[in-house]
């Protein structure tokens, strides 16, 4: 695994091929999670930020930017969208959490919570995922669509199997995240496919 502290994945072009596979041995279904990362893009169209599919299940967990100021979370093919006033283009720190027992999903943008939404109460997110950055999967690890591809930079990505309390979300935003047990930017197992370059993070 690699410590990517102070670095980002750069996706320099629109494509249907360029992506990064994130590898995790997630063995049991997710009842809760929190995902945090930084992103910087000047795309004004819709694009995928984090695509998590399981065998036979599309959009099992997907973080998707619909347009400037609109972030969507898909859980088990169901979707909620939260809105925020944001500058464009500008770097952003995104956290999203979801809790099965209540169905509550919450985005945090640059350390600020958006309006809570609810979806898929009681659902468990399937384990053994294919996780892709840079493309939106329409199958298990493939079937990409150029029009949903990400162009820009992604870094500081962490994923926990719990809903983090606000103080821990703020710690992640401020650059001092808790150790993460699903994906951890400081100990990341990944595969680069296509034209993706690792570069220093210069925009925080």
């Amino acid at each position: 695994h690699t410590d990517l502290s102070g670095k980002v994945f750069v996706f320099p072009r629109e494509s249907v091929t360029d992506h990064v596979n994130l590898i995790t041995p997630l063995e049991k279904p997710l009842q809760n999670f929190t995902l945090c990362f930084r992103a910087y893009s000047d795309l004004s169209r819709a694009y995928s930020l984090f695509s998590y599919n399981t065998q036979g299940r599309d959009n099992e967990l997907l973080v998707y930017k619909e347009r400037v100021g609109e972030y969507s979370l898909y859980i088990g093919r169901h979707k909620v969208t939260s809105k925020v006033i944001e500058k464009f283009p500008a770097p952003v720190h995104i956290c999203v959490s979801w809790e099965s027992s209540s169905g509550i999903a919450e985005f945090w943008i640059n350390g600020t919570p958006l309006v809570k939404k609810g979806l898929r109460q009681g659902y468990f997110v399937e384990a053994q995922p294919k996780i892709v950055l840079g493309q939106e999967q329409d199958s298990y690890g493939g079937k990409f669509d150029r029009s949903q591809s990400f162009v820009g930079e992604i870094g500081d990505l962490y994923m926990w199997d719990s809903v983090l309390p606000p103080e821990n979300i703020l710690s992640a935003y401020q650059g001092t995240p808790l150790p993460a047990n699903i994906l951890d930017w400081q100990a990341l197992n990944y595969e680069i496919r296509g034209y993706v370059i690792i570069k220093p993070l210069v925009w925080v």
Epitope: T2, T24, P25, Q186
Partner: antibody, heavy 119, light 107 residues
Framework: QVQLVQSGAEVKKPGSSVKVSCKAS????????MHWVRQAPGQGLEWMGM????????NYNEKFKSRVTITADKSTSTAYMELSSLRSEDTAVYYC????????????WGQGTLVTVSS | DIQMTQSPSSLSASVGDRVTITCKAS??????VAWYQQKPGKAPKLLIY???YRYSGVPSRFSGSGSGTDFTLTISSLQPEDFATYYC?????????FGQGTKLEIK
């Protein structure tokens, strides 16, 4: 099979420093966080800090931050832990340990190095 | 720092006994707990990770459970080689912290 081999026992005077080494073999040293844990005689385990040899990123337990320095030499696959301003309470066995592939647990340990602080 | 409190601190048991050791965290650590076994003069060995997963090569008589603040290590049928000291560890927050240990002795 990964192995961690530590340097030998040390006897030190109060106020001095000690530097313990931990040499890795049989694996990719630079890809794993290396941790240091100590154990005073008859006591429990205490995490001191960690280093990632590739990035040279470190993280220390605040309790030791002012006195401990963890370094790594990729060319020799060796991690080091230096503890300064030694006092009698620092008498302990010092272990290096490797982070597991996917989780923040320690799956490979060195054999330990006894550091005795005595005037 | 998160305190990990083990109980009992020592325990006498016989070969074949079922033994349970508990570990209580001072705050929620989710399932981010490991259990280690240590024999005198030796380094600790990883037994259980993520509260309930047996590490590679660990006999099936060892099992772990719990989440949040309360965790349990169970040895279903004690073998002679199991007499040792057992430690829990949390890796939910920095600094990582260990319990004070439970010494398992032969009755």
């Amino acid at each position: 099979q990964v192995q961690l081999v530590q340097s030998g026992a040390e006897v030190k005077k109060p106020g001095s420093s000690v530097k313990v080494s931990c040499k890795a073999s049989g694996g990719t040293f630079s890809s794993y966080w290396m941790h240091w844990v100590r154990q005073a005689p008859g006591q429990g385990l205490e995490w001191m800090g960690m280093i990632h040899p590739n990035s040279v990123n470190t993280n220390y337990n605040e309790k030791f931050k002012s006195r401990v320095t963890i370094t790594a030499d990729k060319s020799t696959s060796t991690a080091y832990m230096e503890l300064s301003s030694l006092r009698s309470e620092d008498t302990a066995v010092y272990y290096c340990a490797r982070r597991n592939d996917y989780y923040w647990y320690f799956d490979v340990w060195g054999q330990g190095t006894l550091v005795t602080v005595s005037s | 720092d998160i305190q990990m409190t083990q109980s009992p601190s020592s325990l006498s048991a016989s070969v074949g006994d079922r033994v349970t050791i508990t570990c209580k965290a001072s705050q929620n650590v989710n399932s981010n707990v490991a259990w280690y076994q240590q024999k005198p003069g030796k380094a600790p060995k990883l037994l259980i990770y993520s509260a309930s997963y047996r590490y590679s090569g660990v006999p099936s008589r060892f099992s772990g459970s719990g989440s949040g603040t309360d965790f349990t290590l169970t040895i279903s049928s004690l073998q002679p080689e199991d007499f040792a000291t057992y430690y829990c560890q949390q890796c939910n927050n920095y600094p990582f912290t260990f319990g004070q240990g439970t010494k398992l002795e032969i009755k």
